[in-house]
Interface confidence: medium
Amino acid sequence: DRKRRSDPNFKNRLRERRKKQKLAKERAGLSKLPDLKDAEAVQKFFLEEIQLGEELLAQGDYEKGVDHLTNAIAVCGQPQQLLQVLQQTLPPPVFQMLLTKLPTISQRIVSAQSLAEDDVE
């Protein structure tokens, strides 16, 4: 460990790795995922994402709107129930768009958790 820390390139490599992780997070839409152990933060995030999703859908921005709704599903305690509601309230093409994005959700959560755990000096 001492050897690693005395390596002059270690800090640069670490900085570079964090930069890559940050970019990967942002690309995957993870930059704003809450701490999943913090129930209050998760609830706040869920409500904000539902609201943003609804707002963007109302403005006709279906792609971004669906992204926010999938974020909400990702942290929802009862995703099946929420999906049923969404199926009833969203136009079929929009709901289909949402379904195509669902397989990546659990991966996002896993990635977010592992990135958080890995981000230790």
């Epitope: 409500l47 539902i50 609201q51 999703g53 609804e54 707002e55 109302a58 403005q59 709704l69 929420l82 509601v85 969404l86 309230t89």
Partner: nanobody, 122 residues
Framework: AVQLVESGGGLVQAGGSLRLSCVAS????????MGWYRQAPGKQRVLVAT???????NYADSVKGRFTISRDNTKNTVYLQMNSLKPEDTSVYYC????????????????WGQGTQVTVSS
């Protein structure tokens, strides 16, 4: 989130008129039920008038026939025309925007402006 900015308050003599305006930004204005509430010192905030996205209005009994609420969706603005003002109308007037969630029926989005002071002297 929605930002609401009120204007038009001031000091007026009893029997006079004022027109309050509230400009909304940051959201789809037409989706919201807009309202005016007022709060006198040491008292609860109470409803003055509301107007739905479709234009349906509702008034507190104390202001019926004297106050008129209206909205202009093209300007993202809601107005409160106050006529025949009385000293008891003296309050801070707050603009409110409220919208129910389509997705989560129990959820309502509620936003408030900073308020504008209306003082009616006798």
């Amino acid at each position: 989130a929605v930002q609401l900015v009120e204007s038009g308050g001031g000091l007026v003599q009893a029997g006079g008129s004022l027109r309050l305006s509230c400009v909304a930004s940051g959201s789809t204005f037409s989706n919201f039920v807009m309202g005016w509430y007022r709060q006198a010192p040491g008292k609860q905030r109470v409803l003055v008038a509301t107007i739905s996205s479709g234009g349906s209005t509702n008034y507190a009994d104390s202001v019926k026939g004297r106050f008129t609420i209206s909205r202009d969706n093209t300007k993202n603005t809601v107005y409160l025309q106050m006529n025949s003002l009385k000293p008891e109308d003296t309050s801070v007037y707050y603009c409110n925007a409220r919208r129910g969630s389509v997705i989560v029926p129990t959820l309502a989005y509620d936003y408030w402006g900073q308020g504008t002071q209306v003082t009616v002297s006798s």
